[in-house]
Interface confidence: low
């Protein structure tokens, strides 16, 4: 009888992660008697995948009933494939021996390639907030994909960015790969509602790329502009002075009124109005009893925004004559007062 041959008809098999790989193997003869074993890799460091004779291999099932003596089909199925399963698999016929079975003939091998989807891109921004006109870096990371070829793009509000650097690791062969990209973004005052998007395209995604996003609201700090105005007389000896704090983000803001340099009142912006661009406006007022002052009063609205050094705006209040309206409230539709004091 012709000597047994081990035939692995498939040089390569491509499987998507999570699916089942079928590795085909047939023998041309029923002799010699002995078990079939499957290995990944060759040489002394090869990894046993399945042993017909003994062992427990929960991920492996046989295509046919290997308990039957007349069986010559030694194909196996490996379930729940991951990138770590990639490699060349060998179907090896052993001859019964003593004290151990002896390797008799090996198949040519089947290369299992695993197509693994990249993980959802994770975009992270700078640790500290930055102000408009500054350039900030965003990183995008995605892991676990295979094959190595991958395309990464950056967008800001739908517009593709060009200032970025991307690396795919490792450089050599690997069961799976990771991508790391850093993009530079110039902030503008309108970026509170902006998003930076990292888009990853890969053969496993069938034209439907994965996206990771970062909201620039987590990154940007828009410093407020201040306007102090004197309102019409409320009562004979009282003047209402308002401090309009406009176009700031984030909301964390503390306002202090000073009369001639002395702290009069400190308050925290609680309920504010939101502009269409995502920035906030707030208004605080101070009722000044003019009769309590002999000389002119310098009123200062001092604002500490998001833990930054305070900015201030002053207003000189003339107390010599009856106060008249000095300036007007020119707040736009979204910049009305929103000091929700409980009266």
């Amino acid at each position: 009888e012709e000597e047994l041959q081990v035939i692995q008809p498939d040089k390569s098999v491509l499987v998507a992660a999570g699916e089942t790989a079928t590795l085909r193997c047939t023998a041309t003869s029923l002799i010699p008697v002995g078990p079939i074993q499957w290995f990944r890799g060759a040489g002394p460091g090869r990894e046993l995948i399945y042993n017909q004779k003994e062992g427990h291999f929960p991920r492996v099932t046989t295509v046919s009933d290997l308990t039957k003596r007349n069986n010559m089909d030694f194909s196996i199925r490996i379930g729940n494939i991951t990138p770590a399963d990639a490699g060349t698999y060998y179907c090896v016929k052993f001859r019964k021996g003593s004290p151990d079975d002896v390797e008799f003939k090996s198949g040519a091998g089947t290369e299992l390639s695993v197509r693994a989807k990249p993980s959802a891109p994770v975009v992270s921004g700078p640790a500290a907030r930055a102000t408009p006109q500054h350039t900030v870096s965003f990183t995008c990371e995605s892991h676990g994909f295979s094959p190595r070829d991958i395309t990464l793009k950056w967008f800001k509000n739908g517009n593709e960015l060009s200032d970025f650097q991307t690396n795919v690791d490792p450089v050599g062969e690997s069961v799976s790969y990771s991508i790391h990209s850093t993009a530079k973004v110039v902030l503008t005052r309108e970026d509170v509602h902006s998003q930076v998007i990292c888009e990853v395209a890969h053969v496993t995604l069938q034209g439907d790329p994965l996206r990771g996003t970062a909201n620039l609201s987590e990154t940007i700090r828009v410093p407020p502009t201040l306007e102090v105005t004197q309102q019409p007389v409320r009562a004979e000896n009282q003047v209402n002075v308002t401090c309009q704090v406009r176009k700031f983000y984030p909301q964390r803001l503390q306002l202090t009124w000073l009369e001639n340099g002395n702290v009069s009142r400190t308050e925290t912006a609680s309920t504010v109005t939101e502009n269409k661009d995502g920035t906030y406006n707030w208004m605080s007022w101070l009722l000044v009893n003019v009769s309590a002052h002999r000389d002119d009063v310098k009123l200062t609205c001092q604002v500490e925004h998001d833990g930054q050094p305070a900015v201030s705006k002053s207003h000189d209040l003339k107390v010599s004559a009856h106060p008249k309206e000095q300036g007007s409230n020119t707040a736009a539709e979204n910049t009305g007062s929103n000091e929700r004091n409980i009266y």
């Epitope: 939101e274 009305g336 409980i342 009266y343």
Partner: antibody, heavy 118, light 107 residues
Framework: EVQLVESGGGLVQPGGSLRLSCAAS????????MHWVRQATGKGLEWVSV???????YFPGSVKGRFTISRENAKNSLYLQMNSLRAGDTAVYYC????????????WGQGTMVTVSS | DIQMTQSPSSLSASVGDRVTITCRAS??????LAWFQQKPGKAPKSLIY???RLQSGVPSKFSGSGSGTDFTLTISSLQPEDFATYYC?????????FGQGTKLEIK
């Protein structure tokens, strides 16, 4: 469709407790301030409570210390826990979304009736 | 608390009429004023916010105006479905407060 559905109303004795629920659907619940407003039969509207997106809460003096408001964003649900109930708390209670840029009310539930009586 | 006073408390008008309801705040509310319509047995419906902005789906026959402490709701041409009770509300400061309502009845 944006919808608010209140439940949990009923008859309770003075001094008793009741918990109202409001199930929200059709919008990103966690992004909105949510309010409770009540209306006694034949009377006007009275604002009862608000809970902001950050969990901050406010109450008028009439219910302060007796009512608590809470939200469970994962379940798109708003709650009003009413303790030490009085006859004056008898009303239809509405769940309302503060839906505009300035927290103006835009969506109202159908209301649930609370009767406090011995 | 900020008091909201509506006038008149009730109003009789005919279909096709133009009607105006006024609302006065006890102090400035920075234009955080809303108007609501309520029909018997129903939940209120939001009509107007920040004095003059129409809520989505509200017909343009409703209009709001005013500033400071005095505000008005105008219905340009009354239709049968417009007969209801109307409330103003300030939402400038907590506690938010409503006017006592204006009942609009068919003459």
């Amino acid at each position: 469709e944006v919808q608010l559905v209140e439940s949990g109303g009923g008859l309770v004795q003075p001094g008793g407790s009741l918990r109202l629920s409001c199930a929200a659907s059709g919008f990103t619940f966690s992004s909105y301030d949510m309010h409770w407003v009540r209306q006694a039969t034949g009377k006007g509207l009275e604002w009862v409570s608000v809970i902001g997106t950050a969990g901050d809460t406010y109450f008028p003096g009439s219910v302060k210390g007796r009512f608590t408001i809470s939200r469970e964003n994962a379940k798109n649900s708003l709650y009003l826990q009413m303790n030490s109930l009085r006859a004056g708390d008898t009303a239809v209670y509405y769940c309302v979304r503060g839906g505009n840029w300035d927290d103006a009310f835009d969506i109202w539930g159908q209301g649930t009736m609370v009767t406090v009586s011995s | 608390d900020i008091q909201m006073t509506q006038s008149p408390s009730s109003l009789s008008a005919s279909v096709g009429d133009r009607v105006t309801i006024t609302c006065r705040a006890s102090q400035g509310i920075n234009n955080y004023l809303a108007w609501f319509q309520q029909k018997p047995g129903k939940a209120p419906k939001s009509l107007i916010y920040t004095v003059s902005r129409l809520q989505s789906g509200v017909p343009s026959k409703f209009s709001g105006s005013g500033s400071g402490t005095d505000f008005t709701l105008t219905i340009s041409s009354l239709q049968p479905e417009d007969f209801a009770t109307y409330y103003c509300q300030q939402y400038n400061s907590y506690p938010y407060t409503f006017g006592q309502g204006t009942k609009l009845e068919i003459k």
